[in-house]
Interface confidence: low
Amino acid sequence: AGVFELQIHSFGPGPGPGAPRSPCSARGPCRLFFRVCLKPGLSEEAAESPCALGAALSARGPVYTEQPEAPAPDLPLPNGLLQVPFRDAWPGTFSLIIETWREELGDQIGGPAWSLLARVTRRRRLAAGGPWARDIQRAGAWELRFSYRARCELPAVGTACTRLCRPRSAPSRCGPGLRPCAPLEDECEAPPVCRAGCSLEHGFCEQPGECRCLEGWTGPLCMVPASTSSCLGLRGPSSATTGCLVPGPGPCDGNPCANGGSCSETPGSFECTCPRGFYGLRCEVSGVTCADGPCFNGGLCVGGADPDSAYICHCPPGFQGSNCEKRVDRCSLQPCRNGGLCLDLGHALRCRCRAGFAGPRCEHNLDDCAGRACANGGTCVEGGGAHRCSCALGFGGRDCRERADPCAARPCAHGGRCYAHFSGLVCACAPGYMGSRCEFPVHPDGVSALPAAPPGLRPGDPQRYL
């Protein structure tokens, strides 16, 4: 027993021209919900055949009202997982059908109107207990992004949820023929139901209905002591009470078989029985081929020359990974210049430019001064998307409309007097100082030759502009 879980990440218009702006019809607002249907096997079944593995319906999503002027975003979705419980073994191969439905909320006669907006059908292989598998699928003009996984409900474990866990009976290790249950070693696989009458002490089974004997016992029900009662050459301890009943550590301990393979002991070694899709000594090699359609997002599948890879996916632009399952973060290359915001729309990159910049990558600096006038002889200076005026002397402010007093900042040092002048200002220095701002002391042997006031200016009349 277990649960198939589906997480819808986004549903929205697919890339390219003609993508719909809204899932709603002209009749008004709507909301979305999803239906998932699971069918066993990889055969192309008729769409109307029953969802033999189960089905589930999501909650309704938030109400969506189209805003025609806005670019179509990912649509508001219902929260949470879609969960499809399964009672029996997980088949490993299955068909996944996801339907997106629209519920129109306008004034409908007889209540809301439902219509199927999009449907994707994928044939997949998936082991229970594995990580989330991600997928992106197109259905007409729509694009659906989702993840899914199958997980066992305890006490079931394994890639098919057929093995059961139970508390360990013996203190040190699991009973004969039983493996520890991951992840905790104090749990053991519960035994399958053996053949009726199979000795509880001397027999065990790996499959229902069989009866396999421990060392030293024989017969259809493992009731007959074997003629060789010696433990020589056998693994594990022996004693007068237990004989050879308790096997010691063996080659299958810790299960060397990867990817859900099952281990069986052979003389001095082990053998892995691999699940479909894997092979190799330890089931470590993927046997998936191009026929299984392993390349996502339109990747091109070709047979691999590498012996450890039965296929290679050539990914379309914007995707990477061994199965083209990862979207390339093209914005990480920072293609937008001048502080523009990068948006990866899937089919294209778009830069949202800061004020004052334009172009596909915000590379063009707009003329900030176009149509902007600076008064009183000021000149306009471009910069950073905001115009700035460089004002003529005697003027200030954003547009050079304000009169400025050049003496207001007290530019003359050491008590010098400031006089406004049409070309700026002039400092009349106190005795002992010289320089345009009276910043230099006169040398002891020097003489200050600056006039008390320049011709045409009177002290105390700094606001006269000639």
């Epitope: 997980r151 305890l154 006490p155 508390p167 991951a182 992840p183 905790l184 070693e185 104090d186």
Partner: antibody, heavy 118, light 108 residues
Framework: QVQLQESGPGLVKPSETLSLTCTVS????????WSWIRQPPGKGLEWIGY???????NYYPSLKSRVTISIDTSKNQFSLKLSSVTAADTAVYYC????????????WGQGTLVTVSS | EIVLTQSPGTLSLSPGERATLSCRAS???????LAWYQQKPGQAPRLLIY???SRATGIPDRFSGSGSGTDFTLTISRLEPEDFAVYYC?????????FGGGTKLEIK
Amino acid sequence: QVQLQESGPGLVKPSETLSLTCTVSGGSISSYYWSWIRQPPGKGLEWIGYIYYSGRTNYYPSLKSRVTISIDTSKNQFSLKLSSVTAADTAVYYCARIAVAGFFFDYWGQGTLVTVSS
Amino acid sequence: EIVLTQSPGTLSLSPGERATLSCRASQSVNKNYLAWYQQKPGQAPRLLIYGASSRATGIPDRFSGSGSGTDFTLTISRLEPEDFAVYYCQQYDRSPLTFGGGTKLEIK
């Protein structure tokens, strides 16, 4: 959102039995493992044991002889009993949910301090 | 049982710095079955990382976990004021479940 709340006496006499209950809200107690963890004052975390909703349990070996964890699915509660307590059992006791992805703890109660003193 | 040893016992750093916390197991932890928790005074622990490197829901990406076998590391790339707390590692490969002794991350 799953929430866990511990309840029980804050003071227990030596040699008596400590009893705590954890009430689970915002989700079903079924299909998960549930655990007790304690933390002596100023020290680290110690796992006490867990219980599955079917009643299956597993305890920390050194506490095994004194610990009983039980579950009541109808009340969405599970409980801890620790017998023959001593001052060394003084600690903040936390109940927690064990995650589906592995035997780690994804939701915790806020903890309750139990002092063993006469 | 698997004994987890955390080092250093106390780590004094300033906000904005990078923190590296170590957790060493007495025997190999299979399948990277190791989790990290953060605990602030008077609060319950909070799950940060599981599977040695997977961030739990809602955990900022400045927290990252790495390592395998017997050596595991929790890294906080750029410390925020709220990150100063005690950090514990926990293995869930084998019973009994065990925690490390903790690393106290304090403001320098």
